[in-house]
Amino acid sequence: AVDLTLLANLRLTDPQRFFLTCVSGEAGAGRGSDAWGPPLLLEKDDRIVRTPPGPPLRLARNGSHQVTLRGFSKPSDLVGVFSCVGGAGARRTRVIYVHNSPGAHLLPDKVTHTVNKGDTAVLSARVHKEKQTDVIWKSNGSYFYTLDWHEAQDGRFLLQLPNVQPPSSGIYSATYLEASPLGSAFFRLIVRGCGAGRWGPGCTKECPGCLHGGVCHDHDGECVCPPGFTGTRCEQACREGRFGQSCQEQCPGISGCRGLTFCLPDPYGCSCGSGWRGSQCQEACAPGHFGADCRLQCQCQNGGTCDRFSGCVCPSGWHGVHCEKSDRIPQILNMASELEFNLETMPRINCAAAGNPFPVRGSIELRKPDGTVLLSTKAIVEPEKTTAEFEVPRLVLADSGFWECRVSTSGGQDSRRFKVNVKVPPVPLAAPRLLTKQSRQLVVSPLVSFSGDGPISTVRLHYRPQDSTMDWSTIVVDPSENVTLMNLRPKTGYSVRVQLSRPGEGGEGAWGPPTLMTTDCPEPLLQPWLEGWHVEGTDRLRVSWSLPLVPGPLVGDGFLLRLWDGTRGQERRENVSSPQARTALLTGLTPGTHYQLDVQLYHCTLLGPASPPAHVLLPPSGPPAPRHLHAQALSDSEIQLTWKHPEALPGPISKYVVEVQVAGGAGDPLWIDVDRPEETSTIIRGLNASTRYLFRMRASIQGLGDWSNTVEESTLGNGLQAEGPVQESRAAEEGLDQ
């Protein structure tokens, strides 16, 4: 069973001092931040017992294994059902505490009732403040039964539940009609899934015979021991004021466990601590009684004395629950109450015994749960004891259960039962997860869900190149850390598998399913440098670069050009997808902008080192287009252009540029500068006769401006082929004067 205890402090004079504490003795309990241990939860359960809302309760965590609920302001805050949930996975367990108001009309004679399947349960509500109305019994908040107030017997209302079955379990209440629900008596009924003394799926297995009020768990056959007792059969008493499955916890405060109610996992329920009784667990046991709720009687023999916490304290020469066994009778010594082995191992189990006459090898035997008897293979005889060693055949799951070591001599016999847990080594249910990859390493998360039993002690990661027959490489890692597989080959698929281990011999589980993880391409190592660049317009830049010459093939898929506009905080990236390219035209840039430019080689998704940066200033955008451009043929080789200056100029024009192109021609256009910006007319000379030309022009201030409209004109016929167009310009007025 899960080592989980819910403690209720029942010093009820002041509700503000009331607290509930949930304590877990489980390894790693309550950490909650990792995959191996969900947190402890402690809360009031309002589904069945609803009380008036009050201020929210305060939850405080004390370390990883303890959580406390405080902040109760009035007695009614306490009434109802509280639950603590702890343990991980299939072991997740809920412990329930039911609190009754001490001032209620009806009070339970006993709050927790644990009964076996098929038993008759009797719930008894004692009249504390009488009302002459019906008494309504409810089960889990729903109507169950009605009693007339005359039906009280000796001041008690009884609810008989014959032949109870597990679904009958739950919270029961008895309430006077017309009374507040806070005046109810609340009970908890726990129905074990098996008849008395049995456990297991078909209730075929025999319980170990739990001592000192321990209750046999119907699922796993373990004894859930009352607070203050430990051992497989609860045979051992803890020191006063201690509790927990290994007596590892201590009651808070100077008065020990007085005034505390202890609730343990079902089917135990709740009780006072060992040595205490009463509705508020504040009364010490009467002489001759001991244990939780003082339910046990000592009946010590041979001069033994009764201790209310542990039972009979025997004088020397005697032992046993009632000091009924003489020390001459053989006695099993120091047998562990619980042993754990891994499936399919062949462990050695030791059993030591003493007595008079002295036990010999053949007088000690080991009995398995299926009744098979093993004889010892060797014995070590020492002055005070004989230790027999048993070689156990290969363990199977059915070997889980209670084993027994038995010693028999002419002086009598003794036996000690102990629990053997056969654990299944863990097997991953999923493949590991790739977190990041580089060309020569993979970062892997090995944490995966698994079948079988924990805890996980080690994680092995096995890996090798895909389709390889070479041996697997193995790395052993901490369960909670990510793993880096190093010194791998670039651009290579690796098969990766996880193997989990639990503690103990044979704890290694089978390998989990494989997954394919591929390393990245090799990083490009060459650093380009910028050869040069020139501006081809206010928004166009031609860039060229080079790479160092190295032997072998080029490692790269292309180039990335980056332009950084520091003023606007914007980056422009241009992908050149050929590794042979050494030049690129960048268009759509912002005129008048200062750019920082660099280039780097890329391969797959990896970037090589960037070139040293260059700083480029694009000219600002130029002036508007000239207006009313007009062309007029003057001869077979001359055409005159006239225009009007652009409007709204941002500054003085430095020149005009005229573009001349043969209509329908395939060649590049010719650009001719008009260097006297004040002119509004120019003559283009050296043209071919009878040829149709296209003209457009633009102005320049610091940068070139927008083109004007395009005009067409043909030279006059029958002239000779000219050398090529040239320009002569005058002010328009001057031309008109001539």
Epitope: Y143, D148, E151, A179, P181
Partner: antibody, heavy 121, light 107 residues
Framework: EVQLLESGGGLVQPGGSLRLSCAAS????????MFWVRQAPGKGLEWVSV????????MYADSVKGRFTISRDNSKNTLYLQMNSLRAEDTAVYYC??????????????????WGQGTLV | DIQMTQSPSSLSASVGDRVTITCRAS??????LNWYQQKPGKAPKLLIY???SLQSGVPSRFSGSGSGTDFTLTISSLQPEDFATYYC?????????FGQGTKVEIK
């Protein structure tokens, strides 16, 4: 499905006797209070008697006290009303009904949630 | 015994009307009051318990209110199937007395 089925009604002379039965099904009969309620022709409803689940405590309207006896057989899921010394004013349709209790605003309230179809006496 | 008095004894109303029936107890009964509907030749049917809690399956046009000695059953919009006799009943003490009934007829 909860069902209550009365039987045993009929014509009887004043001073005569009659035993009504109410067969219950669809619920755990032994856990509920059971009631007899009657309705004279053209009149309103009149509470007659109640019996607790255990069969112990019983109560009667003053008009029938000493003449009528309510009883139950939990093993047969049946409620009975033995009527002796019948009078003309006992003429009515007799209904059996189940007593239920439900919580509302924290308190428990009783009511009659299922009724039989009635039998005429 | 606690006497329960309903008013009116009968009323005529049309479909869609809002109808109110009152019930008065001869002594305080807190909220221990139930309302039943009965149609001719049929058994009574529980509508409301605890003065104002609607029994499951009962249309929401039925509502109850009141506490102490004075209680009301309201039908917000009368439907053709609502023409019946309505009874209040106290469940505060034994005997569990009923009101004399209110017959709701078609106008």
């Amino acid at each position: 499905e909860v069902q209550l089925l009365e039987s045993g009604g009929g014509l009887v002379q004043p001073g005569g006797s009659l035993r009504l039965s109410c067969a219950a099904s669809g619920f755990t009969f032994s856990r509920y209070k059971m009631f007899w309620v009657r309705q004279a022709p053209g009149k309103g409803l009149e509470w007659v008697s109640v019996i607790y689940p255990s069969g112990g405590p019983t109560m009667y309207a003053d008009s029938v006290k000493g003449r009528f006896t309510i009883s139950r057989d939990n093993s047969k899921n049946t409620l009975y009303l033995q009527m002796n010394s019948l009078r003309a004013e006992d003429t009515a349709v007799y209904y059996c009904a189940r007593g239920m209790v439900r919580g509302y605003s924290g308190y428990d309230y009783p009511f009659l949630d299922y009724w039989g179809q009635g039998t005429l006496v | 015994d606690i006497q329960m008095t309903q008013s009116p004894s009968s009323l005529s109303a049309s479909v869609g009307d809002r109808v109110t029936i009152t019930c008065r107890a001869s002594q305080t009964i807190s909220s221990y009051l139930n309302w039943y509907q009965q149609k001719p030749g049929k058994a009574p049917k529980l509508l409301i318990y605890a003065a104002s809690s609607l029994q499951s399956g009962v249309p929401s046009r039925f509502s109850g209110s009141g506490s102490g000695t004075d209680f009301t059953l309201t039908i917000s919009s009368l439907q053709p199937e609502d023409f019946a006799t309505y009874y209040c009943q106290q469940s505060y003490s034994t005997p569990r007395t009923f009101g004399q009934g209110t017959k709701v007829e078609i106008k």
